[in-house]
């Protein structure tokens, strides 16, 4: 079952390296590497490194990348993040503190700045930093739907843990909806899973970014670690390029 | 960007056909086609055709086949089904009828007959025939865990529908557990999703196979259409063959 | 996508899924598979040109990467992308068996 | 599976994933990608012999199908199976960008 040809491993490696050169430029739709003439001196900004690390880290609940659609998903996706509106914002006053839920609101103008058109969005993840958890907890994620109604999105069974851990929920469809609508502020609710019989429906898990008495004062590690939306989208100029060349080979 | 070789399409087709001959025999671990000498005359039995059709039909909630694991999942899987224990069995008496749940129990001896070893099971699906549904309903599936406790498994949002439709839940892990344990009867519970605030938690969806007054008398279309477990497993003799040849090429 | 919708209705010369129906009796001379009588196996065929070298007109090549060598292989190859299983009914002795064979039907291809 | 665990620790001659680290500066002469400095791209290499003809000794061949031609291709080919994305940081003008490139890292291969 052998083949006749002997393989020149070094030649194959060189061809693969050259192909990668083309692949990266092609995915970024760059005809040549961007000039570095204007790059500010010094290290990368903190916020950029944080965003890079968020993208690089696989987190609990994030599925491995599915087989991408051939055309649009071949190209690189720009990654941005939009932090949750801080909890002292008046929007939170409308939602009574409860033992079974926490609320997370987002400014849609920030979302639109990051992703100007709903069709450009290829993935949106809600990322939450859960602090240590003593008991197993079954939680559910809801989307604010209309006045005071909430639409179920997904659930997660959280195992006990001694260390903080990032959670990720795929909320692509929801964020695409928000980008299509006119609302200014949109939100999620994280609740304990309530069974029809059970009476103990307390949300035990601590999520970083919530400073109510019930949650303990987490202000020290708030900042960039409060809940955020990680967005992956085709940049507008790349999308226009794609549309104009939408012919087969 | 053309290639030098012209392609003989007919030759490629012939090679593909021959390769399929090998592929099918190889997947079934047959050195040659099985003799047809003992095949009973007449059409295939009803039950076999029903099983074949269940396997062929993609149903709501069943994910497209994931990329299979190379070794064991290359080989063909025998398909069997185990029907739910009928609702007049005394096991159902222990669970009070409620407006928010229905119960489905299975005889583990039947499961073991179909799949002698837990490791042989490659997929188990719980299939339910839902009858027409007037309103959207969010349902949850639970596994009977210990005395009277239930473990959450998954959920489904059912859209309104005028016609009956099969639902499928992947319960591979649960059935594997059951095969490992000593219990005689094991079960599932299908419940309305209960939110922490909401008080209306009635299970609106009708599942074929339940003849309580609340469900209406569906006895006429019971039979083979009551809930069942569709099992895909490596036959024992094929598995033994696999273990003995578990060396790398 | 290089799927049956696109490929069966075009005269694509490059990598594409090609139609192939296997009739168990006619093509394989088999009577032992009772259901189905045959199936659309299909297959992948067509070149995936290697389209990168330092002296290429880059801008022209970049747009083609997506189709011809998305994985940046040193020797791209036309292979199945989406596959589907095939259930069959056959007898072993007097006992009918239903078995599912994974990855038997090619729905789409890709250069990889 | 023909993955990094198996292939990097064996001397497999047939289809397998092979180690390849790309250092953007050294291998591509690029300074414009600020993070990461390089990545484990890897690649697939090795024969997938075509192992079926009517005069073959069936029983010997059948056991090899699984490895060499599981998809019953007319010309099986060693291609990536599991792929992972690569995020990068680069500047466009004065503006840093984080972008995710899909399917850049080969984790395992298969004959297809």
């Amino acid at each position: 079952l052998s083949t006749c040809k002997t393989i020149d491993m070094e030649l194959v490696k060189r061809k693969r390296i050259e192909a990668i050169r083309g692949q990266i430029l092609s995915k970024l739709r760059l005809a040549s590497p961007p000039s570095q003439g204007e790059v500010p001196p010094g290290p990368l900004p903190e916020a950029v490194l944080a965003l890079y690390n968020s993208t690089r880290d696989r987190v609990a609940g994030e599925s491995a990348e599915p087989e991408p659609e051939p055309e649009a998903d071949y190209y690189a996706k720009e990654v941005t993040r939009v932090l949750m509106v801080e909890t002292h914002n008046e929007i939170y006053d409308k939602f009574k503190q409860s033992t079974h839920s926490i609320y997370m609101f987002f400014n849609t103008s920030e979302l639109r700045e990051a992703v100007p058109e709903p069709v450009l969005l290829s993935r949106a993840e809600l990322r939450l930093l859960r602090l240590k958890l003593k008991v197993e907890q079954h939680v559910e994620l809801y989307q604010k739907y209309s006045n005071n109604s909430w639409r179920y999105l997904s659930n997660r069974l959280l195992a006990p843990s001694d260390s903080p851990e990032w959670l990720s929920f795929d909320v692509t469809g929801v964020v695409r909806q928000w980008l299509s609508r006119g609302g200014e502020i949109e939100g999620f609710r994280l609740s304990a899973h309530c069974s029809c019989d059970s009476r103990d429906n307390t949300l035990q898990v601590d999520i970083n970014g919530f400073t109510t008495g019930r949650r303990g004062d987490l202000a020290t590690i708030h900042g960039m670690n409060r809940p955020f939306l990680l967005l992956m989208a085709t940049p507008l100029e790349r999308a226009q390029h794609l549309q104009s060349s939408r012919h087969r080979r | 960007l053309s290639t030098c070789k012209t392609i003989d399409m007919e030759l490629v087709k012939r090679k593909r056909i021959e390769a399929i001959r090998g592929q099918i025999l190889s997947k079934l671990r047959l050195a040659s086609p099985p003799s047809q000498g003992e095949v009973p005359p007449g059409p295939l039995p009803e039950a076999v055709l029903a099983l074949y059709n269940s396997t062929r039909d993609r149903v709501a909630g069943e994910s497209a086949e994931p990329e299979p694991e190379p070794e064991a999942d290359y080989y063909a899987k025998e398909v069997t089904r185990v029907l739910m224990v009928e609702t007049h069995n005394e096991i159902y008496d222990k669970f009070k009828q409620s407006t928010h749940s229905i119960y489905m129990f299975f005889n583990t001896s039947e499961l073991r007959e179909a799949v002698p070893e837990p490791v042989l099971l490659s997929r188990a699906e719980l299939r339910l025939l839902r009858l027409k549904l007037k309103v959207e309903q969010h349902v949850e599936l639970y596994q009977k865990y210990s005395n009277n406790s239930w473990r959450y498994l998954s959920n489904r949002l059912l859209a309104p529908s005028d016609s009956p439709e099969w639902l499928s839940f992947d319960v591979t892990g649960v059935v594997r557990q059951w095969l490992s344990r000593g219990g005689e009867i094991e079960g599932f519970r299908l419940s309305a999703h209960c939110s922490c605030d909401s008080r209306d938690n009635t299970l609106q969806v009708d599942i074929n196979g339940f003849t309580t007054g609340r469900r209406g008398d569906l006895a006429t279309i019971h039979g083979m259409n009551r809930p069942f477990l569709l099992l895909m497993a490596t036959p024992l003799e094929r598995a033994q063959h696999l273990q003995s040849s578990r060396h790398r090429r | 996508a290089l799927d049956t919708n696109y490929c069966f209705s075009s005269t694509e010369k490059n990598c594409c899924v090609r139609q192939l129906y296997i009739d168990f009796r006619k093509d394989l001379g088999w009577k032992w598979i009772h259901e189905p009588k045959g199936y659309h196996a299909n297959f992948c065929l067509g070149p995936c040109p290697y389209i990168w070298s330092l002296d290429t007109q880059y801008s022209k090549v970049l747009a083609l990467y997506n189709q011809h060598n998305p994985g940046a292989s040193a020797a791209p190859c036309c292979v199945p992308q989406a596959l589907e299983p095939l259930p069959i009914v056959y007898y072993v002795g007097r006992k009918p068996k239903v078995e599912q064979l994974s990855n038997m039907i090619v729905r789409s291809c890709k250069c990889s | 599976a023909l993955d990094t665990n198996y292939c990097f620790s064996s001397t497999e001659k047939n289809c397998c994933v092979r180690q390849l680290y790309i250092d953007f500066r050294k291998d591509l002469g690029w300074k414009w990608i600020h993070e990461p400095k390089g990545y484990h791209a890897n690649f697939c290499l090795g024969p997938c012999p075509y192992i079926w003809s009517l005069d073959t000794q069936y029983s010997k061949v059948l056991a090899l199908y699984n490895q060499h031609n599981p998809g019953a291709s007319a010309a099986p080919c060693c291609v990536p199976q599991a792929l992972e994305p690569l995020p990068i940081v680069y500047y466009v003008g004065r503006k840093p960008k984080v972008e995710q490139l899909s399917n850049m890292i080969v984790r395992s291969c298969k004959c297809s």
Partner: antibody
Framework: EVQLVESGGGLVQPGGSLRLSCAAS????????MSWVRQAPGKGLEWLGF??????????EYSASVKGRFTISRDNSKSSLYLQMNSLKTEDTAVYYC???????????WGQGTLLTVSS | DIQMTQSPSSLSASVGDRLTISCRAS??????LNWYQQKPGKTPKLLIY???RLHSGVPSRFSGSGSGTDYTLTISSLQPEDVATYFC?????????FGQGTKLEIK
């Protein structure tokens, strides 16, 4: 088709001021940096500066020889680029080109140029 | 600023000749080297960018090569319409700077 058309050149006395314009068409103006390059009679090309695109906040960059005297601006609603030149010197006499600049460090399309003569 | 030096400053060649023009940078410019053609009385046109990449519509008889500080523009078979002045330009470090030009004539 990308087109760049300069206008506004002419004769100016030393110390005087002038504004050059460049009308762009055939591409999404806000996506691109726009640049000015000049060429003194019988001499080589000299880059004067550019104005960045929307993602880079439309900020400007100048060469040392014109910094403080020349100002580049743009009117995106009109797809127009401008070069405001003050305190002109005789050595500013040249053909002034507007050029589209790409992130790759090169100018891919140029206008036909407009001649400025600074003379007393 | 990075200085760009072209050589020769002028050259004369026959139709069909292969010829090269050199450009040297005062420091490593990492392949960000571009070539422009300016025909008499006309506007400059981009020929080659990033050392070796042909701009769209440019005939394939033009090619570029080089690395570090030394770069070359090659015309494989000179045509009458190639009479022009050729400029190199670095795009590695601000301010962008051009070579002084090479004037090409036909014998």
């Amino acid at each position: 088709e990308v087109q760049l058309v300069e206008s506004g050149g002419g004769l100016v006395q030393p110390g005087g001021s002038l504004r050059l314009s460049c009308a762009a068409s055939g591409f999404t103006f806000t996506d691109y940096y726009m640049s000015w390059v000049r060429q003194a009679p019988g001499k080589g090309l000299e880059w004067l500066g550019f104005i960045r695109n929307k993602p880079n906040g439309y900020t400007t960059e100048y060469s040392a020889s014109v910094k403080g005297r020349f100002t580049i601006s743009r009117d995106n609603s009109k797809s127009s680029l401008y070069l405001q030149m003050n305190s002109l010197k005789t050595e500013d006499t040249a053909v002034y080109y507007c050029a589209r600049y790409t992130g790759g460090g090169y100018f891919d399309y140029w206008g036909q140029g407009t001649l400025l003569t600074v003379s007393s | 600023d990075i200085q760009m030096t072209q050589s020769p400053s002028s050259l004369s060649a026959s139709v069909g000749d292969r010829l090269t023009i050199s450009c040297r940078a005062s420091q490593d410019i990492s392949n960000y080297l571009n070539w422009y053609q300016q025909k008499p009385g006309k506007t400059p046109k981009l020929l080659i960018y990033y050392t070796s990449r042909l701009h769209s519509g440019v005939p394939s008889r033009f090619s570029g090569s080089g690395s570090g500080t030394d770069y070359t523009l090659t015309i494989s078979s000179l045509q009458p319409e190639d009479v022009a002045t050729y400029f190199c330009q670095q795009g590695d470090t601000l301010p962008w700077t051009f070579g002084q030009g090479t004037k090409l004539e036909i014998k």
